[in-house]
């Protein structure tokens, strides 16, 4: 069990003077009512800070913004309004920051009654910025090329979708009537548009269109559209089938020249799809149930985006504000997060280690009690608070953390008990991807990781009283150290550290607020004086991934490898550093069925590991067939798991099958579709239909 | 001291039966992966058999599969070989190792070994 | 099977040299690869476990690194006691394998 701050700890030396020394206060001079801060580039140390004031009058709205720079991860900020002649920028998408470390920012303002709009642009990490007028008004953030920081991309109030390819100096139009516009990869440009006048009545009537020359030509590359997303390599597209409401997904893996209809259930018009999580190997998707269930079911893809296999029932995602608790636990291969509404209408918490294949409750942490939700008190399981939670409005202040390059670690705040409670909840801690969790904090807190898992660092949630304490553990959470970085508590609003946890700043965003006054101010706090030396060899040891028997020598074996890490010794205080790179050597493990998906006309019998084919597909099943190239329609019965490397040991060999007797698909068909050059294309009509929240990569 | 003996070893013929043991002491016998590991004349080392603390693992060299049966016994602190169908080439000191009770651990006790000889 | 290669097969130093051996496996094995010495008539012993991790009781001079499919074991300044056969091991995959052994004399 993990000791609190009162047991003995090991204790950090002298931290409070070496955190003293290194505390930084700024007070910002405004009474603006928000507050948004920005990180620019990678380990450049810039922020910027919009702060906004917005007061209705009447019929319009009266705004004020204030624009702070800092280059030293927030300890001081400059004042840099002047530099956007005092221009009010709107707060909801106002800065939209360039990709990788090109040091580019888009700043939108707020003209109001305009027909037009405009923009501050900078190419040097904000340092100077260049006004520009638009012949448009936004209607969300402009949004970059991924692949050239050049090339943006924006769509206007009344629909009509613009290119810039030289950093917003010139501005031309692409299309009009355009419900939906993403960019793909080379930088291509996918788009719905309608020619009916209305994305909002109209669903289900779009074209799907394609660029991949910014507008000199377009192609039509899908109709009968209802939505689309993109999600690692795939395209993907709900179609209407014909049959009245319903729709199905359709995919592409070529850019929209090919399409294949996917193995899975078609939907009416009050369900939905959504990409939970999408990689270059597979897709999760989710199916909502027919009715107002408020759930549904998981499924995962093969290889092709095509087939798919049931993975998880009963999967929670609320129809209503579209709420999903699915979680990608990032700091391990194969481990994702997602709770399911049980047949008794509790919410319970479920984790599946080997991406999708087998989900679990949580284990229980060893330092907890069952709380009174449990039906027997020595069995329960932990349940992670998530989207949901926060939702349905209890006290957690965030959603689970983890990091790619903090190996193992995980932290969320949940309850322990047959189901989520709806009690306080505490901060628990993995350090081996969810495996096993220890109870680190009482009550909720904000939390954030440092230094690629060296520090942690959190401040408990507390709305009817100042705070001006920070807790921090410099192992993983085992025990936790006490400053006080203010005499006077302040109203807390947040903690910010730079994206990618390779920091060892922290800031805490709060303000203070008397009859006459209120005003912003950080705090922000360098570690480095805590973790004083780098570490060395000697700090690291190696450490399994996804070990559950250390006697079996197929211990570990996740997709058919496994993988030693070096990780930090709890024990070692020292710098991993901003160069750290995850240490990691995998090892390939030997096949056996576990490693296998069925192809499509094959299924798996319950409690058995091999695939039979289905004794016929008829009926509605015609819908699930592959389209497209030949090879869609050979199969050996079994299908690698997307992403899996096993070798030797098992290895399944069906004879060939022709399913071509068996099934038809009939989706717009590449000679069907048709292209034209630039000249402005016809239609009408808007609607932002699918959106990005909680790395949700695509909700219809 | 922890220590691992092994005895059992002998001449006997092409075709004959064996049956190693190794007697465990100094640790807990029941908590770890124990291993028969062989060296013929002049040879380098080559695994044989290896089973987990519970016998729920049992792995063996292709060179032994339905030959040779690994055992053990917690109560009484030992480790078996029983050697079935022996052949010339098994001919070898039969070494008994703990391994470590780590993921993929070293072999980090080894006994003095028994010599097996296999002639006719 | 992963096959592991080690080199030298021989070896002849005079004392306090430095004495490098080499193993190769046929695959990546991880940090899974454990270094044994063997001295006439006696048992294996382990010094290194886990590519670089020093057993406990041999002497520093023993040391391992190399991760993957590349392993050195290298003895710092040769001891006339360190006169053995040392033997490389991986412990990844079944079934387990040795290396063919490296004799080190001492001229």
């Known amino acids: 069990s993990a000791p609190g701050e009162d047991e003995e700890c090991g204790r950090v030396r002298d931290f409070v003077a070496k955190l003293a020394n290194n505390t930084h206060q700024h007070i910002f001079n405004d009474l603006s009512g928000s507050v948004s801060l920005s990180w620019v580039g990678d380990s450049t140390g810039v922020i910027l800070v919009l702060t906004t004031f917005q007061v209705p009058i009447f019929m319009i709205t009266i705004g004020q913004s204030k624009l702070y720079r800092s280059e030293d991860y927030g300890k001081n900020f400059k004042d840099i309004t002047d530099l956007i002649n005092n221009t009010f920028i709107r707060s909801d998408f106002g800065i939209a920051i360039g990709p990788e470390n090109s040091g580019k920012v888009v700043l939108t303002a707020d003209v109001s009654g305009s027909h037009g709009s405009r923009i501050f642009r900078s190419s040097d990490f904000a340092k100077n910025f260049v006004q520009q007028e638009l012949p448009f008004v936004p209607l969300m953030q402009i949004m970059y090329s991924p692949q050239n920081s050049d090339y943006l991309l924006a769509l206007s109030n009344k629909n009509e979708l613009w290119v810039s390819k030289n950093f917003g100096g010139k501005w031309e139009k692409l299309y009009d009537t355009v419900c939906l516009a993403k960019w793909g990869s080379d930088n291509t440009i996918f788009f719905t548009a309608n020619h009916n006048g209305s994305c909002s009545n109209d669903r289900g009537m779009l074209e799907l269109w394609r660029t991949s020359d910014l507008g000199k030509s377009f192609k039509t590359i899908g109709s009968k559209i209802y939505s689309f997303g993109l999600g690692g390599r795939f395209l993907f597209a709900s179609v209407m089938t014909g049959k009245g409401t319903l729709r199905a997904i359709h995919v592409s893996t070529d850019q929209g020249d090919t399409w294949s209809m996917a193995q899975l259930p078609p939907v009416g018009h009050e369900q939905f799809y959504s990409i939970l999580a999408a990689n270059d190997d597979m897709v999760f998707m989710h199916v909502d149930e027919p009715g107002d269930s408020g759930f549904g079911t998981i499924f995962t893809s093969d290889d092709r985006g095509i087939v798919y296999s049931k993975s998880l029932e009963r999967h929670l995602y609320t129809t209503t504000g579209g709420e999903t608790d699915f979680t990608n636990v990032t700091s391990l291969r194969g481990v994702y997060i997602t709770s399911i509404l049980a047949e008794d209408k509790s919410v319970q918490s479920m984790i599946t280690f080997d991406q999708g294949g087998r989900w679990t409750h949580l284990r229980k942490p060893e330092n907890s009690k069952c709380d009174a939700t449990a039906r027997d008190p020595e069995k329960c399981s932990l349940h992670i608070h998530a989207a949901y939670s926060i939702a349905t409005g209890l006290n957690v202040p965030m959603l689970p953390l983890s990091e790619p390059n903090a190996v193992g670690i995980v932290i969320a705040h949940g309850s322990v008990g047959d189901a989520i409670s709806v009690m306080r909840p505490d901060v628990y801690i993995s350090d081996d991807g969810g495996y096993s969790w220890t109870k680190a904090l009482e009550g909720p807190h904000h939390y954030t990781i440092l230094d690629s898992g060296g520090i942690i660092v959190a401040v408990e949630q507390n709305a009817h009283q100042g705070v001006n304490q920070i807790k921090f553990s410099t192992d993983e959470g085992q025990c936790w150290q006490t400053y006080n970085f203010t005499k006077d508590p302040i109203f807390f609003t947040g903690l910010a550290s730079e994206p990618g946890a390779r920091s060892m700043n922290i800031s805490i965003w709060g303000y203070r607020s008397s009859l006459f006054h209120q005003y912003w101010i950080s705090y922000t706090i360098d570690f480095k004086d805590i973790l004083e030396r780098n570490c060395e060899e000697k700090d690291y040891t190696i450490w399994l991934a996804h070990s559950t028997d250390p006697e079996d020598y197929e211990d570990g074996c996740i997709l058919g490898y496994k993988e030693q890490f070096l990780r930090l010794r709890k024990s070692s205080v020292c710098q991993n550093g901003r160069d750290y790179v995850v240490t990691k050597q995998p090892s390939i493990c030997l096949c056996s069925l576990e490693d296998f998906l069925c192809d499509f006309g094959y299924y798996r019998p319950e409690n058995d590991s091999k695939c039979v084919e289905q004794p016929e597909l008829k009926g509605h099943d015609l819908e699930f067939c592959l389209y497209g190239r030949e090879e869609h329609l050979t199969t050996n019965g079994y299908r690698k798991i997307p992403g899996d490397k096993c070798q030797g040991g098992v290895n399944p060999v069906r004879e060939v099958k022709d399913l071509k007797k068996k099934c038809t698909s009939n989706f717009l068909s590449p000679e069907k579709q048709n292209s034209k050059s630039n000249g402005s294309a016809g239609g009408s009509g808007g609607l932002n239909d699918i959106f990005e929240a909680q790395k949700i990569e695509w909700h219809e | 001291e922890v220590q691992l003996v092994e005895s059992g070893g002998g001449l006997v013929k092409p075709g004959g039966s064996l049956r190693l043991s190794c007697a465990a002491s100094?640790?807990?016998?029941?908590?770890?992966?124990m291993n028969w590991v062989r060296q013929a004349p002049g040879k380098g080392l080559e695994w044989v058999s290896s089973?987990?603390?519970?016998?729920?693992?049992?792995y063996y060299a292709d060179s032994v599969k339905g030959r040779f049966t690994i055992s053990r016994d917690n109560a009484k602190n030992s480790l078996y070989l029983q050697m079935n169908s022996l052949r010339a080439e098994d001919t070898a000191v039969y070494y008994c190792?703990?391994?470590?009770?780590?993921?993929?651990?070293?072999?980090?006790?080894w006994g003095q070994g028994t010599m097996v000889t296999v002639s006719s | 099977e992963i096959v592991l290669t080690q080199s030298p097969d021989f070896q002849s130093v005079t004392p306090k040299e430095k004495v490098t051996i080499t193993c190769r496996a046929s695959?990546?094995?991880?940090?899974?690869l454990h270094w044994y010495q063997q001295k006439p008539d006696q048992s294996p012993k382990l010094l290194i476990k886990?590519?670089?991790q020093s057993f406990s009781g041999v002497p520093s001079r023993f040391s391992g690194s190399g991760s993957g499919t590349d392993f050195t074991l290298t003895i710092n300044s040769l001891e006339a006691e360190d006169a053995a056969a040392y033997y490389c091991?991986?412990?990844?995959?079944?079934?387990?394998?040795f290396g063919g052994g490296t004799k080190v004399e001492i001229k």
């Open positions: 886990y590519a670089s």
């Open positions: 190792a703990r391994r470590g009770s780590g993921s993929y651990d070293a072999f980090d006790i």
């Open positions: 089973i987990s603390s519970s016998s729920s693992y049992i």
């Open positions: 100094g640790f807990t016998f029941s908590s770890y992966s």
């Open positions: 091991h991986q412990s990844s995959s079944l079934p387990l394998t």
């Open positions: 695959q990546s094995i991880g940090y899974s």
